[in-house]
């Protein structure tokens, strides 16, 4: 062993990382809420819309207390990755009517990508099991019509909103355990 190393270069502590992840998730939640409202204004939703390919909501707020850190982060990352793919798909195959949601959809996609990288780094710093960030997934079929694309957008933004709301609560709770 040689001489002691000089002062280490400083990167964020996991707890600080968790703080900034919460801030990013809150900001993404606000973006999603705003975009969903914009979509409702332009194309009012006739009832609830579902998309079979979307993940089911991870957890009710009441059941959060029993969650463990690895489970929350793994599930959250898997769900957000699915939403990222759906947003990409929406931008690519959603049709001309959804072009009115640009550049906001593009910003949402970039922030979602950033949040996923944050979660990956957090899991790495904590040395938690790390499922592959980009697992292979079957391609999503294009919407059957323009209205199908709009219905899909309602479902995607609505589901993402619920997931991010759950994520903020979950991450704040986890911070108390770290």
């Amino acid at each position: 062993p040689g001489p002691p190393p000089g002062p280490p270069r400083v990167s964020p502590d996991p707890r600080a990382e968790l703080d900034s992840t919460v801030l990013l998730t809150r900001s993404l939640l606000a973006d999603t809420r705003q975009l969903a409202a914009q979509l409702r204004d332009k194309f009012p939703a006739d009832g609830d819309h579902n998309l079979d390919s979307l993940p089911t909501l991870a957890m009710s707020a009441g059941a959060l207390g029993a969650l463990q850190l690895p489970g929350v982060l793994t599930r959250l990352r898997a769900d957000l990755l699915s939403y990222l793919r759906h947003v990409q798909w929406l931008r690519r195959a959603g049709g001309s009517s959804l072009k009115t949601l640009e550049p906001e959809l593009g910003t949402l996609q970039a922030r979602l990508d950033r949040l996923l990288r944050r979660l990956q780094l957090l899991m790495s710093r904590l040395a938690l099991p790390q499922p592959p960030p980009d697992p292979p997934a079957p391609p999503l079929a294009p919407p059957s019509s323009a209205w199908g694309g709009i219905r899909a957008a309602h479902a995607i933004l609505g589901g993402l909103h619920l997931t991010l709301d759950w994520a903020v609560r979950g991450l704040l709770l986890l911070k108390t355990r770290l």
Epitope: P8, Q120, L121, S124, A127, L128, P129, D134
Partner: antibody, heavy 114, light 111 residues
Framework: EVQLLESGGGLVQPGGSLRLSCAAS????????MHWVRQAPGKGLEWVSV????????YYADSVKGRFTISRDNSKNTLYLQMNSLRAEDTAVYYC???????WGQGTLVTVSS | QSVLTQPPSASGTPGQRVTISCTGS?????????VHWYQQLPGTAPKLLIY???ERPSGVPDRFSGSKSGTSASLAISGLRSEDEADYYC???????????FGGGTKLTVL
Amino acid sequence: EVQLLESGGGLVQPGGSLRLSCAASGFTFSSYGMHWVRQAPGKGLEWVSVISYDGSYKYYADSVKGRFTISRDNSKNTLYLQMNSLRAEDTAVYYCAAGVPDYWGQGTLVTVSS
Amino acid sequence: QSVLTQPPSASGTPGQRVTISCTGSSSNIGAGYDVHWYQQLPGTAPKLLIYSNNERPSGVPDRFSGSKSGTSASLAISGLRSEDEADYYCAAWDQSLNGPVFGGGTKLTVL
């Protein structure tokens, strides 16, 4: 200032055992996963083992599986590596490292020779 | 043999820009895991240089930058200085090993 200080290295015969320790200070030890990484003389870095922030997950490189055991004591801010059935090819400087790893100690030399 | 492949050596003159490549596979870099870079000055312990593909810890000059694409990554050093002479290692998580893997290291010589 972040400090990781390894100890417990030395000369040991093939088949023997050693226990390395790493004392951490200057950061929240219990919030970081911890690694052992080694470097044989004149060679590159080789990851040995990792333990999660709370000790619930432990992983090992194939080359040390079944012979080495990683553990930690968060109340003492200390990381350990119990090395059994040592072989000549385990001769290296052993570094303890925190996080990604973000922070590294200065290393302790383990020599396995008869 | 290392799981991540790096050129054993690289060189450049002061002020030049040099890049060091790091090639992995579908179980590490190609699976989407982040790449980290370390600098090991002669006789000292490694230090984190770049994390999460292109993030610099505070204290690392912006002459150092990282990028990642597909199954490979690269480290770029611009405005090369004599104090940059060191060994550089890339690392990424590997899902088949359940741990990080390192490249074999690149010895950078400043001519």
